[in-house]
């Protein structure tokens, strides 16, 4: 009975995600056969999150909308380790929107998920951000500094990175 109800719960949870994620890749968490963590196929996983590189070229607003219709947000980067994981899947000649913007152009940067902006955990290229008209953040590669963040005009089409919490079933 316990196993049956657990299976029913899992199936209903999977149905929630089916519209945008017809296929999930799941791994067993720890030693307990009951606990599985999943990411949509072909998203990648790191710690408790799933990541998707969107190769369509869109403005920041539309990139965020694109992530949201998949149940995600533009990526919020919380640690150096997380950034190091993300960049493994990026192309050096492309730029990617992050979930970081300065809507008022007053250098009050904010993350899409309301995570407090912490100046000590930022990875701006040197000299960036540097323009009040450039109110959205991208991650890109500079040969001198490797990967880092840059401010850019929000309407310039870019690729983007989506992030969502792992699905636990």
């Amino acid at each position: 009975n316990f196993m049956y109800s657990k299976t029913v719960k899992r199936l209903s949870k999977l149905r929630e995600y089916q519209q945008y994620h017809p296929s999930l890749t799941c791994v067993m968490e720890g030693k307990d056969i009951e606990d599985w963590s999943c990411c949509p196929t072909p998203w990648t996983s790191f710690q408790s999150s799933c990541y998707f590189i969107s190769t369509g070229m869109q403005s920041w607003t539309k990139s965020q909308k694109n992530c949201s219709v998949m149940g995600a947000d533009l990526v919020v980067i919380n640690t150096r380790e997380e950034q190091d994981f993300i960049i493994q899947n990026l192309k050096r000649n492309s730029s990617y929107f992050l979930g970081l913007s300065d809507p008022g152009g007053r250098r009050h940067w904010q993350w899409v998920d309301q995570t407090p902006y912490n100046e000590n955990v930022t990875f701006w290229h040197s000299g960036e951000p540097n323009n009040l008209d450039e109110r959205c953040a991208i991650i890109n590669f500079r040969s001198s500094e490797e990967w880092g963040w840059n401010d850019i005009h929000c309407h310039v089409p870019q690729k983007s990175i989506c992030k969502m919490k792992k699905i636990y079933i």
Partner: antibody, heavy 118, light 107 residues
Framework: QVQLVQSGAEVKKPGASVKVSCKAS????????IHWVRQAPGQGLEWMGT????????SYNQKFKGRVTMTRDTSTSTVYMELSSLRSEDTAVYYC???????????WGQGTLVTVSS | DIQMTQSPSSLSASVGDRVTITCRAS??????LAWYQQKPGKAPKLLLY???TLAEGVPSRFSGSGSGTDYTLTISSLQPEDFATYYC?????????FGGGTKVEIK
């Protein structure tokens, strides 16, 4: 008031290049993207690409990649669209358009007719 | 790339008629759609954006609706100055493609 004034008509031979200019006035030039759209005689509209005048970032329609180059001169508030390796099918009116705050084309230039003929 | 299919390609109507033009996208464009009016020898003029928001100075007889992949431009009572060609354009992702156009002619 916002104005986009384009350069005059051009006649070019196949294989040549053309450079069309679009001079902006009435707003802060570096704050808005400029897009280029073309229209062949009696045909529909085709998006070619865009440039952000503040930093010079560009995004091109793959169809024109390698043949189109968009540049800007902030000192004269002018954007340029250069199309190379011209062929007869490139005969068209070329328009510049400003992308407004709402992310749509709110102001257009008057158009520049480019004729490619041997 | 998202393709935009506009219909009809032309129509004949009289002053006072209600006119409907449709635009179908090959994928969901999430209401990021504009409608333009173009007269011979002139640049296009923005009529509506975000599928249904009237651009500044555009008469209220123009309206837009739709969602997902299907969108409509309606002119509630056609006026003499409305005889022109109408284009839709999506702004979801590049390339920002246009529909093929609808020429509205006098019957």
């Amino acid at each position: 008031q916002v104005q986009l004034v384009q350069s005059g008509a051009e006649v070019k031979k196949p294989g040549a290049s053309v450079k069309v200019s679009c001079k902006a006035s009435g707003y802060t030039f570096t704050s808005y993207l400029i897009h280029w759209v073309r229209q062949a005689p009696g045909q529909g509209l085709e998006w070619m690409g865009t440039i952000y005048p503040g930093r010079g970032d560009t995004s091109y329609n793959q169809k024109f990649k390698g043949r189109v180059t968009m540049t800007r001169d902030t000192s004269t508030s002018t954007v340029y669209m250069e199309l190379s390796s011209l062929r007869s099918e490139d005969t068209a009116v070329y328009y510049c358009a400003r992308m407004g705050d709402n992310e749509y084309f709110d102001y257009w230039g008057q158009g520049t007719l480019v004729t490619v003929s041997s | 790339d998202i393709q935009m299919t506009q219909s009809p390609s032309s129509l004949s109507a009289s002053v006072g008629d209600r006119v409907t033009i449709t635009c179908r996208a090959s994928g969901n464009i999430h209401n990021y759609l504009a409608w333009y009016q173009q007269k011979p020898g002139k640049a296009p003029k923005l009529l509506l954006y975000d599928a249904e928001t009237l651009a500044e100075g555009v008469p209220s007889r123009f309206s837009g609706s739709g969602s997902g992949t299907d969108y409509t431009l309606t002119i509630s009572s056609l006026q003499p100055e409305d005889f022109a060609t109408y284009y839709c354009q999506h702004f979801w992702s590049t390339p920002y493609t246009f529909g093929g156009g609808t020429k509205v002619e006098i019957k």
